[in-house]
C-alpha cells in the first residue's frame, strides 16, 4: 500500500447481518478510514473493549473509524457495535505492516495490492508489532510456575532479538532447567521459576537501522509455609448398618511434609475430657502423607461400639489442623427392609 493511500471499507452502507470478521494490514503512517453502518445511524467503534472518542488522532465518529496516521500502537482488535445494542457489525484486527514505496510515482497505487508486483521496501528501524501483548510489565509469579516474555517486533531488515537479565547478556546457562528462546515468536520462556530468577529482563531488538528495548520485571513469590489444609466437609458424617464396612476420607494439602493421624474419641470413667481439657482419644492409624491410603480410614464389619466421633489430625513443621466426623451405627434391619434396600450404607 502506498503511504498516501487510505485503507477503507466502503461504501458506508448498512452491513449484512453476518458480522464481518477480517484482518487488515496497514502500513505505518497511512491514514485509515473504516465505515460501519449508515452515516446517520453509524455504529460505535471500540478498540480492545474501550469506546473510541469522537475526536483525536484515532476517533470513532458517525460510524467511521478514522486514524490520521497509523502507528504501531494502533494495531489491535476493533469492533463496531450497533447503536443501542451489543450487535457486532464489524469485527476486525488491524496489523502493522511495513510501509512500501513505489519505484514509479506514476504507478497506479492499487497495483500494490498485487503480490506479484515488485516492491522496494525502505529500511526501517525495529518497531513493536503487538504492543498490547507487552502490556503486562510487572510479573509476580509463584515459585514453580512457567514465565513467558514476548517482544514481537518487525523492521527492515528483519531485526534480531537478544535478552538481558539485570543488564547482562542472558542465555540461561547458569539456570537450572535453562531457558527456551523462540526467536520466531520473539519470546523467552523459563519453566519452574525459583527466587534466583527475580530481576529485570530486557528484550533488545536490533537491525542495521536502529534498536528498541523493553523491560519486564519478574518477582518470584515463595510459597508461604502454612499448617496443613484439610478439605472442607471431610471426613463426612456417616451412618452405617451393623456388619457393614465404612470408609472415612480426609484430604490433606501441605507444602511441608505432613504427618497424619486418625483418632477415635473415647470415654474414660464416664468423661470425654481429661483434666487438661483435651479429649480422650485412641490413635487408630498414623503415617506420613506418602504412605498408601493414609488419607482413608477403613472400618470393617462395624459394630455398635464403633459409633462415635472420629478425627483426622494432620501436622507439619508449621502447625496442626484437624476435622472430625460422627459415625452412627444402626442395628441390622429386618430382612424385608434389607431386601428392598440392599445398599444399607449411606452418607449424610
Amino acid at each position: 500500500l502506498e503511504a498516501s493511500e487510505e485503507v477503507e471499507l466502503e461504501p458506508c452502507l448498512a452491513p449484512s447481518l453476518e458480522q464481518q470478521e477480517q484482518e487488515l494490514t496497514v502500513a505505518l503512517g497511512q491514514p485509515v478510514r473504516l465505515c460501519c453502518g449508515r452515516a446517520e445511524r453509524g455504529g460505535h467503534w471500540y478498540k480492545e473493549g474501550s469506546r473510541l472518542a469522537p475526536a483525536g488522532r484515532v476517533r470513532g465518529w458517525r460510524g467511521r473509524l478514522e486514524i490520521a496516521s497509523f502507528l504501531p500502537e494502533d494495531a489491535g482488535r476493533y469492533l463496531c457495535l450497533a447503536r443501542g445494542s451489543m450487535i457486532v457489525l464489524q469485527n476486525l484486527t488491524l496489523i502493522t505492516g511495513d510501509s512500501l514505496t513505489s519505484s514509479n510515482d506514476d504507478e497506479d497505487p492499487k497495483s500494490h495490492r498485487d503480490p506479484s508486483n515488485r516492491h522496494s521496501y525502505p529500511q526501517q528501524a525495529p518497531y513493536w508489532t503487538h504492543p498490547q501483548r507487552m502490556e503486562k510489565k510487572l510479573h509476580a509469579v509463584p515459585a514453580g510456575n512457567t514465565v513467558k516474555f514476548r517482544c514481537p517486533a518487525a523492521g527492515n531488515p528483519t531485526p534480531t532479538i537478544r535478552w538481558l537479565k539485570d543488564g547482562q547478556a542472558f542465555h540461561g546457562e547458569n539456570r537450572i532447567g535453562g531457558i527456551r528462546l523462540r526467536h520466531q515468536h520473539w519470546s523467552l520462556v523459563m519453566e519452574s521459576v525459583v527466587p534466583s530468577d527475580r530481576g529485570t529482563y530486557t528484550c533488545l531488538v536490533e537491525n542495521a537501522v536502529g534498536s528498541i528495548r523493553y523491560n519486564y520485571l519478574l518477582d518470584v513469590l515463595e510459597r508461604s509455609p502454612h499448617r496443613p489444609i484439610l478439605q472442607a466437609g471431610l471426613p463426612a458424617n456417616t451412618t452405617a448398618v451393623v456388619g457393614s464396612d465404612v470408609e472415612l476420607l480426609c484430604k490433606v494439602y501441605s507444602d511441608a511434609q505432613p504427618h497424619i493421624q486418625w483418632l477415635k474419641h473415647i470415654v474414660i470413667n464416664g468423661s470425654s475430657f481429661g483434666a487438661d481439657g483435651f479429649p480422650y482419644v485412641q490413635v487408630l492409624k498414623t503415617a506420613d502423607i506418602n504412605s498408601s491410603e493414609v488419607e482413608v480410614l477403613y472400618l470393617r464389619n462395624v459394630s455398635a461400639e464403633d459409633a462415635g466421633e472420629y478425627t483426622c489430625l494432620a501436622g507439619n513443621s508449621i502447625g496442626l489442623s484437624y476435622q472430625s466426623a460422627w459415625l452412627t451405627v444402626l442395628p441390622e434391619e429386618d430382612p424385608t427392609w434389607t431386601a428392598a434396600a440392599p445398599e444399607a450404607r449411606y452418607t449424610d
Epitope: K137, H139, D219
Partner: antibody, heavy 118, light 110 residues
Framework: EVQLLESGGGLVQPGGSLRLSCAAS????????MGWVRQAPGKGLEWVSV????????DYADSVKGRFTISRDNSKNTLYLQMNSLRAEDTAVYYC???????????WGQGTLVTVSS | QSELTQPPSASGTPGQRVTISCSGG????????AHWYQQLPGTAPKLLIY???QRPSGVPDRFSGSKSGTSASLAISGLRSEDEADYYC???????????FGGGTKLTVL
C-alpha cells in the same frame, strides 16, 4: 472494593523519624508492586519508593535514598515507609499506591500529611 | 525538576476541546506506556487514562489519550466545569525502576 488507608503522619522535627503504614484491603495484596508517592504543599506528585511483591527488591527516588526504607508484611496486608533524618523539604502528603502490572498506579490511598518543622 | 514535561496551565470554555501535552525520554515515555491522573482540589489523584489510550470504567469518553515516540497527550472534549483540576502524566522509568510524573497541568474552565 480496593482500599488503601495510610496512617502515621504528623509533625516531626528536622532530623527526626516517622513510620508510615498503609493498610490494604479488598484485593490480594501479595502479588502487587506497591509504592509511595508524595506531594509537597502546592506542588506536583513525586515518586518516593516502590517495593516488589516478595519484598526483596526496593527502589527509591534519589531525594530519599539512604534515609527512607520501604517494607511490607504480606501476612498483614500492610505497606510501610520508615523515614529517618527528615528534612523540611520532606513535608508533604504521602500517598500509598497500588502499582498495576502495566506500571501505573491504579489505586491510591487518601494520603497522610507529614510536616517537618522546628 | 520533573522527568516528564507538561505545561503548567491550560484553560478552555465549557464545551471546548483542550489538549495537554507531556514529553519525556526514551527510558520512560519512549519505551513504556503513558498514563494520566486527575486530581480534583483537596483529593487524592485518580487514574484517568492508562496504557496510552485506555479509560478505566467510570471515566467519560470525553477524555482520550494518545502517545507517539516520547510524547503523549491528553484530550478533553466537551469541557465541563467539573473538569477543573490538576492533570498529571506519568510513565514507568526503566532507569529508576519506578514511575515518573510530569509537573502537572492546572486546567481552568473559564
Amino acid at each position: 472494593e480496593v482500599q488503601l488507608l495510610e496512617s502515621g503522619g504528623g509533625l516531626v522535627q528536622p532530623g527526626g523519624s516517622l513510620r508510615l503504614s498503609c493498610a490494604a484491603s479488598g484485593f490480594t495484596f501479595s502479588p502487587y508492586w506497591m509504592g509511595w508517592v508524595r506531594q509537597a504543599p502546592g506542588k506536583g506528585l513525586e515518586w518516593v519508593s516502590v517495593i516488589w511483591p516478595s519484598g526483596g527488591t526496593t527502589d527509591y527516588a534519589d531525594s530519599v535514598k539512604g534515609r527512607f526504607t520501604i517494607s511490607r508484611d504480606n501476612s498483614k496486608n500492610t505497606l510501610y515507609l520508615q523515614m529517618n533524618s527528615l528534612r523540611a523539604e520532606d513535608t508533604a502528603v504521602y500517598y500509598c499506591a497500588r502499582v498495576h502490572p502495566a506500571g501505573h498506579n491504579d489505586h491510591w490511598g487518601q494520603g497522610t500529611l507529614v510536616t517537618v518543622s522546628s | 525538576q520533573s522527568e516528564l514535561t507538561q505545561p503548567p496551565s491550560a484553560s478552555g470554555t465549557p464545551g471546548q476541546r483542550v489538549t495537554i501535552s507531556c514529553s519525556g525520554g526514551y527510558s520512560n515515555m519512549g519505551s513504556n506506556y503513558a498514563h494520566w491522573y486527575q486530581q480534583l482540589p483537596g483529593t487524592a489523584p485518580k487514574l484517568l487514562i492508562y496504557n496510552n489510550n485506555q479509560r478505566p470504567s467510570g471515566v467519560p469518553d470525553r477524555f482520550s489519550g494518545s502517545k507517539s515516540g516520547t510524547s503523549a497527550s491528553l484530550a478533553i472534549s466537551g469541557l465541563r466545569s467539573e473538569d477543573e483540576a490538576d492533570y498529571y502524566c506519568a510513565a514507568w522509568d526503566d532507569s529508576l525502576s519506578g514511575p515518573v510524573f510530569g509537573g502537572g497541568t492546572k486546567l481552568t474552565v473559564l
